[in-house]
């Protein structure tokens, strides 16, 4: 014959434990029902009556099956340098994480207690290791033959362009400037002609096209930002 199914509250057999989603009440000395997530124990069980559960009030929660007399208070609202990635509900606490451009300098069990802005690498320096959710950017000087002319928490150093003839040599914070070696076809009045370098820098996501013979004035214009060290080496 199948064993009788006991309904809560019931006295457990000596040496045995209560079933899943039940707890042993020391006062009643009975196995009693736990309350589901989002609820708490309003009235504890007795020898003759089971636990009475009630819903958590606003701004409070319980995440687990429980028999707590009061729900837990949700954490305070997220600060201006944070975003709420999980709202406060009856079943879960609010989670605040750092907004883009910031990292968690002091974490808590879930989310972040204190956010700090990601370090920006100054010209002549690039992002050696990107920032992660929990670690700051590491800046290092540009290696020989590379440069960065931006102040950025994402830009890396990129190679100097290679010129037939160098007008101004590149350095850690400036690209090389190429000069013309021989007269070329005329351009619009006032335009300054600088030929394409022998080998242009690679674009961020595409292979370098073969050098064009078309004239270019781009080297007198402000340099665009270095390709970003997008994404991050997460923990």
């Amino acid at each position: 014959l199948p064993a009788q199914v006991a309904f809560t509250p019931y006295a457990p057999e000596p040496g045995s434990t209560c079933r899943l989603r039940e707890y042993y009440d020391q006062t009643a000395q009975m196995c009693c029902s736990k309350c589901s997530p989002g609820q708490h124990a309003k009235v504890f069980c007795t020898k003759t009556s089971d636990t009475v559960c009630d819903s958590c009030e606003d701004s409070t929660y319980t995440q687990l099956w429980n028999w707590v007399p009061e729900c837990l208070s949700c954490g305070s609202r997220c600060s201006s340098d944070q975003v709420e990635t999980q709202a406060c509900t009856r079943e879960q606490n609010r989670i605040c994480t750092c907004r883009p451009g910031w990292y968690c300098a002091l974490s808590k069990q879930e989310g972040c207690r204190l956010c700090a802005p990601l370090r920006k690498c100054r010209p002549g320096f690039g992002v050696a290791r990107p920032g992660t959710e929990t670690s700051d950017v590491v800046c290092k000087p540009c290696a020989p033959g590379t440069f960065s002319n931006t102040t950025s928490s994402t830009d890396i150093c990129r190679p100097h362009q290679i010129c037939n003839v160098v007008a101004i040599p590149g350095n850690a914070s400036m690209d090389a400037v190429c000069t013309s070696t021989s007269p070329t076809r005329s351009m619009a009045p006032g335009a300054v002609h600088l030929p394409q370098p022998v080998s242009t820098r690679s674009q961020h996501t595409q292979p370098t096209p073969e050098p064009s013979t078309a004239p270019s004035t781009s080297f007198l214009l402000p340099m665009g930002p270095s390709p970003p060290a997008e994404g991050s080496t997460g923990d």
Partner: antibody, heavy 118, light 107 residues
Framework: EVQLVQSGAEVKKPGATVKISCKVS????????LHWVQQAPGKCLEWMGW????????KYGQKFQSRVTITADTSTDTAYMELSSLRSEDTAVYYC???????????WGQGTLVTVSS | DIVMTQSPATLSVSPGERATLSCKAS??????VDWYQQKPGQSPRVLIY???IRYTGIPARFSGSGSGTEFTLTISILQSEDFAVYFC?????????FGCGTKLEIK
């Protein structure tokens, strides 16, 4: 140009500890992050960890975390990698590699062969 | 951990021809992929970083492309000195991981 010169080959017994050095010349060691990479025979390259000699901050690969210690001496521009509790599968060439603001491993040492054998 | 899978394991190509090497990441790594060349008895050296930026001093015949999970290293006109092992590496998340390499050999 930065150059990385590593210490010579080592033969160790299982359970022992090895400490390899990596001397940076041409530039200050603080201009780079220094990584250590393992290349075991017939295996893929494995990243072990890095140190920022500027503030001695380290980051280790989980596989090596309990056994590896990376340090740096800025006065001699030298980084060190110590691997403890050696076992036969640690027989490998160990490389140090310098990481500048390019975000890549710009320059590598010549490698140090560590043989673990009883 | 992010797994970097390189194919083919061995590629036989004649000098002067084009070689295309593939690297696939087990999850999105953005453009955080570098390519390294290693010759027998030598240390690796960087060719391409951030998926497509040719490192300073690297010949124009080497180019990199791709983003997300699929990356390609192309050597447009193979020279005799290009026959070596090529590794890809991702630095999107820790641990930094390498592919097991493609051996480029003379056909």
């Amino acid at each position: 140009e930065v150059q990385l010169v590593q210490s010579g080959a080592e033969v160790k017994k299982p359970g022992a500890t090895v400490k390899i050095s990596c001397k940076v010349s041409g530039y200050s060691i603080t201009d780079y992050l220094l990584h250590w990479v393992q290349q075991a025979p017939g295996k893929c390259l494995e990243w072990m960890g890095w140190i920022d000699p500027e503030d001695a901050k380290t980051k280790y690969g989980q596989k090596f975390q309990s056994r590896v210690t990376i340090t740096a001496d800025t006065s001699t521009d030298t980084a060190y990698m110590e691997l403890s509790s050696l076992r036969s599968e640690d027989t490998a060439v160990y490389y140090c590699a310098a990481n500048s603001g390019t975000g890549t491993m710009d320059a590598w040492g010549q490698g140090t062969l560590v043989t673990v054998s009883s | 951990d992010i797994v970097m899978t390189q194919s083919p394991a061995t590629l036989s190509v004649s000098p002067g021809e084009r070689a295309t090497l593939s690297c696939k990441a087990s999850q999105n790594v953005g453009s955080n992929v570098d390519w390294y060349q290693q010759k027998p008895g030598q240390s690796p050296r960087v060719l391409i970083y951030k998926a497509s930026i040719r490192y300073t001093g690297i010949p124009a015949r080497f180019s990199g492309s791709g983003s997300g999970t699929e990356f390609t290293l192309t050597i447009s006109i193979l020279q005799s000195e290009d026959f070596a092992v090529y590794f890809c590496m991702q630095s999107k998340s820790y641990p930094i991981t390498f592919g097991c390499g493609t051996k480029l050999e003379i056909k």
